[in-house]
């Protein structure tokens, strides 16, 4: 084994280095001392470190470690944060487009149903966006509310436009009849299935991205234990006590220390791998009715078809509803 | 039959939309994100090695520090001696993760469970039933476009593409700026422009 170089007889080098770390403090001994009070940098002979210096080194070592960890995760963190923002904004734009498409369909095909239809469509798409953001709104309720609100307007404006104003109190009865008579056929059920599946997947996709950010933030801001601080100090700074300023830690030794310090963090690995692979599976399945872009941008067409379905059956429906809701004052149909 | 909404800008305004060279879909964006994420799949297991490679470590020097003394880089003492008489490294590992790490592991387990449930092939059985329920819909074929709804001539194929560039859409909202609460009503000729969401690399 090569003999260690003789320690700096005056501790001058150590002082000038330590001054950069802690300006103005007189903690460095003038000449090497026994260092019997040291707890981390246990000396084999005279040392240029004091207990105060050791404490400062420990603090610096833990700060270094935190900075290294943050720089390690910077690219990954940026990737997920940026994408979470882009997707959230894109989903809002899709909802906005879908609403505009649907409103435009009403304006061009059924102008007599506006502005009420605009209001119901607007409220439906507000709920859609809130659902994506994590609200506990039920998708089936949203769709039912849309069709429940639309039917009275369709009945009084399209199917029975000659209805006197005095008969307009039949709205509640019409809302009830809408479900019981399956006025829109299976279209509401179709929309429920498509919208709930696509929105569920979208919502979980966003939740997963946000959790990814949370995972990285958590490990980014970890406070390392005292034991870890001591190990890091021994590795990075104890050599300075012997005046060995230019010496670097051994690679294998560094790996052992890091594995010790990061034992807890490394436990995340298994679940992190699973997270990425599960997210990949989800993304691979986000097509057709599992793709909100696809489903929402096509809703106007399905709603249009559902109204055509009502119009096609208008004769039968008007007769049945006429009987059903004639006495709606006495008999609330719901 | 329903007009396709892109022909529907109110008052039949003719919109000159700049030609979009590159149309990026949300699904391609998602796949691109997954590919990038997969390059970080070993992020946590590789952290100790990453930190050692980004902090001062003896690479070309003959001598290196093992925590107690100067040793030759390839000697057995290079990894071992520095840990002696200090504290038990095994004990440090046995302590288990910090409470915050345990908490985040629980959250990961939960989201992984949710993600798996959503991706399960058996969760997709319903897809078939939709086509069999008889919505008077024609056969839409199996191409990339999704046929949604559709009775007779009302059937429309919706391209699965949301343009990220040069997006124009008619907006029927009252789009007033915050703080700007003067009387405002939707105008029939209002056209709102959607901004470029940009590319993330």
């Amino acid at each position: 084994q090569p003999p260690p170089p003789p320690p700096d007889a005056t501790c001058h080098q150590v002082r000038s280095f330590f001054q950069r770390l802690q300006p103005g403090l007189k903690w460095v001994p003038e000449t090497p001392v026994p260092g019997s009070d040291l707890q981390v940098c246990l000396p084999k002979g005279p040392t240029c470190c004091s207990r105060k210096m050791e404490e400062k080194y420990q603090l610096t070592a833990r700060l270094n470690m935190e900075q290294l960890l943050q720089s390690a995760s910077m690219e990954l963190k940026f990737l997920i944060i940026q994408n979470a923002a882009v997707f959230q904004e894109a989903f809002e734009i899709v909802v906005r487009h879908a609403k505009n498409y649907t409103n435009a369909m009403f304006k061009n095909n059924y102008p007599s149903l506006t502005p009420q239809a605009f209001e119901f469509v607007g409220e439906f798409f507000t709920d859609v966006s809130l659902y994506i953001l994590g609200s506990d709104i039920n998708v089936d309720d949203m769709v039912n509310e849309l069709f429940d609100s639309l039917f009275p307007v369709i009945y009084t404006q399209l199917m029975n436009p000659g209805l006197p104003d005095s008969a307009l109190d039949i709205n509640e009865c019409l809302r009830g009849a809408r479900r019981d008579l399956k006025v829109f056929g299976n279209f509401p059920k179709l929309i429920m299935t498509q919208v709930s599946k696509s929105l569920q997947v979208t919502r979980i996709f966003l939740q997963a991205l946000n959790l990814g950010i949370e995972v990285i933030n958590t490990t980014d801001h970890l406070k390392f234990s005292k034991d870890c601080g001591r190990m890091l100090t021994r590795m990075w700074y104890c050599s300075y006590c012997q005046g060995l300023m230019m010496v670097k830690p051994c690679g294998g030794y560094c790996n052992v220390v890091m594995q010790g310090c990061m034992a807890g963090v490394v436990e995340i690995d298994k679940y992190w791998r699973e997270y990425i692979l599960s997210l990949e599976e989800l993304v691979n399945g986000m097509y057709r009715i599992y793709d909100m872009e696809n489903v929402l941008l096509g809703l106007f067409s399905t709603i249009h078809d559902s109204i055509q379905y009502v119009q096609k059956n208008a004769g039968k429906l008007t007769t049945t509803i006429g009987k059903l809701c004639a006495h709606s004052q006495q008999r609330q149909y719901r | 039959s329903a007009y396709y909404p892109e022909d529907l800008f109110i008052d039949k305004k003719v919109l000159k939309v700049a030609h979009v060279e590159h149309e990026e879909t949300l699904s391609s964006r998602r796949r691109e994100l997954i590919q990038k994420l997969k390059s970080f799949i070993s992020f946590y297991s590789a952290l100790p090695g990453y930190i050692c490679s980004h902090s001062p470590v003896a690479e070309n020097d003959t001598l290196c520090w093992n925590g107690q003394e100067l040793v030759e880089r390839y000697s057995q003492k290079a990894a071992r001696n520095g840990m002696k008489n200090q504290f038990n490294l095994h004990e440090l590992k046995m302590k288990g993760p910090e409470p915050v790490v345990s908490q985040i592991i629980d959250k990961l387990k939960h989201i992984n469970q949710l993600l798996r449930t959503m991706s399960m092939p058996k969760g997709r059985v319903l897809d078939k039933n939709l086509d069999e329920e008889g919505f008077e819909s024609g056969d839409c074929g199996d191409d990339e476009d999704e046929c949604i709804g559709g009775s007779g001539d009302g059937m429309i194929k919706v391209k699965n593409q949301l343009r990220f560039l040069a997006e124009l859409a008619y907006d029927l909202d009252v789009d007033d700026a915050p703080g700007n609460s003067q009387q405002a009503t939707p105008k029939d000729n209002e056209i709102s422009t959607f901004h470029n969401l940009g590319n993330v690399h």
Epitope: A84, F118, F125, L130 | D175, P178, N180, Q183, T185
Partner: antibody
Framework: EVQLVESGGGLVQPGGSLRLSCAAS????????RSWVRQAPGKGLEWVSA????????YYADSVKGRFTISRDNSQNTLYLQMNSLRAEDTAVYYC?????????????????WGRGTLVTVSS | EIVLTQSPATLSLSPGERATLSCRAS??????LAWYQQKPGQAPRLLIY???NRATGIPARFSGSGSGTDFTLTISSLEPEDFAVYYC?????????FGQGTKVEIK
Amino acid sequence: EVQLVESGGGLVQPGGSLRLSCAASGFTFSSYARSWVRQAPGKGLEWVSAISGGGGRTYYADSVKGRFTISRDNSQNTLYLQMNSLRAEDTAVYYCAKNYYGSGSASYWYFDLWGRGTLVTVSS
Amino acid sequence: EIVLTQSPATLSLSPGERATLSCRASQSVSSYLAWYQQKPGQAPRLLIYDASNRATGIPARFSGSGSGTDFTLTISSLEPEDFAVYYCQQRSNWPPTFGQGTKVEIK
């Protein structure tokens, strides 16, 4: 002048009820979703409830769900908050606020016009 | 729900000085964050929405920045009327939530 004016606050016993009103002027009332936001004495702001422009959709914070009911009368340009089963922790200044976006917005939940607030004190 | 943590709780500065207020979210809120100003006995006033857009009528000395989890409101040169409590609010996740506030007081 564009403004919102709240009224109906006061002292009420735990378990009691109160109805707050908010009169709007200077803008098209029915075009906008509206909210109630409260502020406990010396504390921060807490969103309580919202209603869409047409009144067809209502939203509540978990802390008030099942106890509070939001409603609006667009013909009177007035927003209401019916508060039942009141608790000591409901003590606050209640502000009526206009959501930044119109009815049917894609989740624009900022508040760009506020009233001066009305104080609700729940105490025995 | 998302928790917004504002710091510092109190900021003591003199008129003409620069004020930097911070708001940290418990998870990413993209850029869907607003800042409000509230003076004693008054209603809050919207200053900034979507992280960096000034609301109508708000002076240019107010600016917002940040995205994801960390946001900053900067008042470049404090005027006497700027001494107030400032709140951040997110609309990224349901329900909308506010921070606990930062009081900017005269030194």
